[in-house]
Structures are given as structure tokens and as C-alpha cells.
């Protein structure tokens, strides 16, 4: 089973130091600051799910050196930054979207020995995520226009 | 296979510094998500875990003890050290260490998988 | 600090006998709970973690279970080679604890 913890409370300060190893954040409705990071030294599990976030701001990650799991399922994701695709040893957990294939194809050029990225569809169902880019997503359209939500399943 | 072994000075009297090393095989310490913690357990009780050194060299102590805590490592040595100043006779345990590391398929979980056999410490004038 | 309370302290079972070992946390811990075995003289090996998952090799009569702040470890039908102490963990906060153990006997 995947390791859980608890919702935090709604009201985040995002000037405040979080200690624990994993925090919960689903389903609160959150806007994430562009110019803060957070601050959760020990974190290895983040969940962002559930939160209607539209992208992911690198900034916020920046200071997350021992994350290991990100979980943004049920979001509409319209881009994924490269520089957090490019941590090869972060876990992502998202919605199958057209809007991952940036993340595909940085892992794929700059991440090796890496097992296949999965995505999730709306009956939480697992799909390698070549496979869904793939089927789903013709070619060169999320990366031409920017987005590739077209795709998005709610 | 993933070993560890702890070594340590077994006697030593009040006031003094103890060191103790973790020498290991199997893995590396440079591995992103791997780290070793040092966890002591007095003679009939429980476990108290005292510090975690982190594949990047960050750190994390015991509160209660981490005036007295250093934790450091050799990466190209395969070994961990920590030492504890001013012992008392509280500080009489054994000492372990244990390894932590990130698995894909435990990948956000944090256990102890493999533990050394410990050391015996005294501290005794 | 997370304080963790294993009960009981000492139960002796009968061989085939269904055991169950409490944990409880101070606080809200999720599933971030590890149970570890120790046989005399030696060190702990880890049986459960995640508050439910087997850990590699353990045999499949040890189950785990709870979430928050109540853990359960069961030994669906106790061997005589389960003689130990029997150590919960938390690792949701540093600094990480443990509970103060639960002696199984064996009649």
C-alpha cells in the first residue's frame, strides 16, 4: 500500500517550516506561490493532489532535495516544468495528459535505467505513459501549443 | 548482499568521547535516498534512535542529545561515524546501525531495512 | 516529541494461539509505522512497514495494520521461533521513536 498521512489544515502558511516526512495538501483548493519555496526539508511524500493546480512553479519545489513521491492526480495540468522533470529519482503521480510529454521526453534524454512513467485515468487505472502519449496525444501538438489539456480527463 | 557492522571501544570512563563506526557493504552512501541512521538500545529496553546522515551529507539528531552528536561519513570508505561527547553512564547501550533506503516499490516510505549486528558500549569508572 | 505505547508490556501464548500487540502514537502519525522483531541477542529486523506491508521474506502469519495514531501487529498463529521482543516505529517526524517494546513467551 502507499504510505499516508493526514490533511493538513486549509489555512497553509507557506512561511512555515514543515518537519514531518510526508504532507498531505489534497483537495484543499491551494494556490501554490511562484516565488516561495516550501519549506519541508525531510519531505519525501507531497501530495498536491486534488487541487485544481494548473502547473507545478519550480520555485515551490526548489528546496524539496529528498522529495521522492509527487502526487498531483486529479489536476488539470497544462504544463510540467522541465526543470522538475528532470529530477530523475522524483516519483510523479498524474493524470494521464497530454501535458506530460515534456516530462516523458526529458526523462527519456536525460534520466537512465529509469523504470516506465505511469499515468492515471479517471477510474484511477494505471497506463505506461509512452503508451497513453502515444494513442492519446498526436504528435508535436502539447509541445507546439504549450498546453495539451485538450486531452485532460476529468 | 547488504551488511553493516558497527565497531566501537566496548570500555571507557565518564566525561570521555565516544566514537563508534559503521563500516558497510552492498550498497552506496552516495546513492540518491540512501542514509544510515545510529539507533542505541540500553541493556532490557527499548530503542532510541540518535541521528541519520543523508546520501547529500545533510544531517538529522535526536534533540535531546544533539549537543553531544556528531554524525559524519566516508562515502569512499563505505563507513559512517558517530561520536558522542561527555558520556555518562547513561550512555551505556548498544549501539546499531541501520540503513534507509528509497525502493520503487516502497518508494515515500522510510523503515529500517537492514540493521547491523550492534556494539556493546560501557561507560564505567 | 512523538511519544509511542506498545501494549502489553509481556504476554506469554501457546504455540498456534492468535497474538496481537498494540501501538499507540501521541499523534497522528498516517501509515508512517515500522514493526521490527528481536530475538535474543540479536538485532532488530524489520517485519512490517508502512504500517501494513510485509516487508520482504516475512512470513505471511505476521500482518500489519492502523493508520493515525492505533497500529496493530498480528501473528495469525504463533510459532515457537517467534519468541522476541517486538518493537514499534514511527518515522512520519524527527526524531523518529519507538515504543518500549512487547516481550512474546512462549508456553
Known amino acids: 500500500l502507499e504510505p499516508s498521512c493526514t490533511v493538513s489544515s486549509a489555512d497553509v502558511d507557506w512561511n512555515a517550516e514543515f518537519s514531518a516526512t510526508c504532507l498531505n495538501f489534497s483537495g484543499l483548493s491551494l494556490s501554490l506561490p511562484h516565488n516561495q519555496s516550501l519549506r519541508a526539508s525531510n519531505v519525501i511524500l507531497l501530495d498536491l493532489s486534488g487541487n485544481g493546480l494548473r502547473e507545478l512553479p519550480v520555485t515551490f519545489f526548489a528546496h524539496l532535495q529528498k522529495l521522492e513521491v509527487l502526487n498531483v492526480l486529479r489536476n488539470p495540468l497544462s504544463r510540467v516544468d522541465g526543470a522538475l522533470a528532470a529530477r530523475c529519482d522524483l516519483d510523479l503521480q498524474a493524470d494521464c495528459n497530454c501535458a506530460l510529454e515534456s516530462w516523458h521526453d526529458i526523462r527519456r534524454d536525460n534520466c537512465s535505467g529509469q523504470k516506465p512513467l505511469l499515468c492515471w485515468d479517471t477510474t484511477s487505472s494505471q497506463h505506461n505513459l509512452s503508451a497513453f502519449l502515444e494513442v492519446s496525444c498526436a504528435p508535436g501538438l502539447a509541445s507546439a501549443t504549450g498546453s495539451g489539456h485538450h486531452h485532460h480527463h476529468h | 548482499q547488504v551488511t553493516l557492522k558497527e565497531s566501537g571501544p566496548g570500555i571507557l570512563q565518564p566525561s570521555q568521547t565516544l566514537s563508534l563506526t559503521c563500516s558497510f557493504s552492498?550498497?552506496?552512501?552516495?546513492?540518491?535516498?540512501?542514509?544510515v541512521s545510529w539507533i542505541r538500545q540500553p541493556s532490557g529496553k527499548g530503542l532510541e534512535w540518535l541521528a541519520h546522515?543523508?546520501?547529500?551529507?545533510?544531517?538529522r539528531y535526536n534533540p535531546s542529545l544533539k549537543s553531544r552528536l556528531t554524525i559524519s561519513k566516508d562515502t569512499s570508505s563505505n563507513q559512517v561515524f558517530l561520536k558522542i561527547t561527555s558520556v555518562d553512564t547513561a550512555d551505556t547501550a548498544t549501539y546499531y546501525c541501520?540503513?534507509?533506503?528509497?525502493?520503487?516499490?516502497?518508494?515515500?516510505?522510510?523503515?529500517?531495512?537492514?540493521w547491523g549486528a550492534g556494539t556493546t558500549v560501557t561507560v564505567s569508572s | 516529541d512523538v511519544v509511542m505505547t506498545q501494549t502489553p508490556k509481556s504476554m506469554s501464548m501457546s504455540v498456534g494461539e492468535r497474538v496481537t500487540l498494540s501501538c499507540k502514537a501521541s499523534?497522528?502519525?498516517?501509515?508512517?509505522v515500522s514493526w521490527y522483531q528481536q530475538k535474543p541477542e540479536q538485532s532488530p529486523k524489520l517485519l512490517i512497514y508502512?504500517?501494513?506491508n510485509r516487508y520482504t521474506g516475512v512470513p505471511d502469519r505476521f500482518t500489519g495494520s492502523g493508520s493515525a495514531t492505533d497500529f496493530t501487529l498480528t501473528i495469525s498463529s504463533v510459532q515457537a521461533e517467534d519468541l522476541a521482543d517486538y518493537h514499534c516505529?514511527?518515522?512520519?517526524?524527527?526524531?523518529?521513536?519507538f515504543g518500549g517494546g512487547t516481550k512474546l513467551e512462549i508456553k
Open positions: 541501520a540503513r534507509r533506503h528509497r525502493d520503487y516499490d516502497s518508494r515515500g516510505h522510510w523503515y529500517f531495512g537492514v
Open positions: 546522515i543523508y546520501w547529500d551529507d545533510d544531517k
Open positions: 516505529g514511527q518515522s512520519y517526524n524527527y526524531p523518529f521513536t
Open positions: 499523534e497522528n502519525v498516517g501509515t508512517y
Open positions: 552492498g550498497f552506496s552512501l552516495s546513492t540518491s535516498g540512501m542514509g
Open positions: 508502512g504500517a501494513s
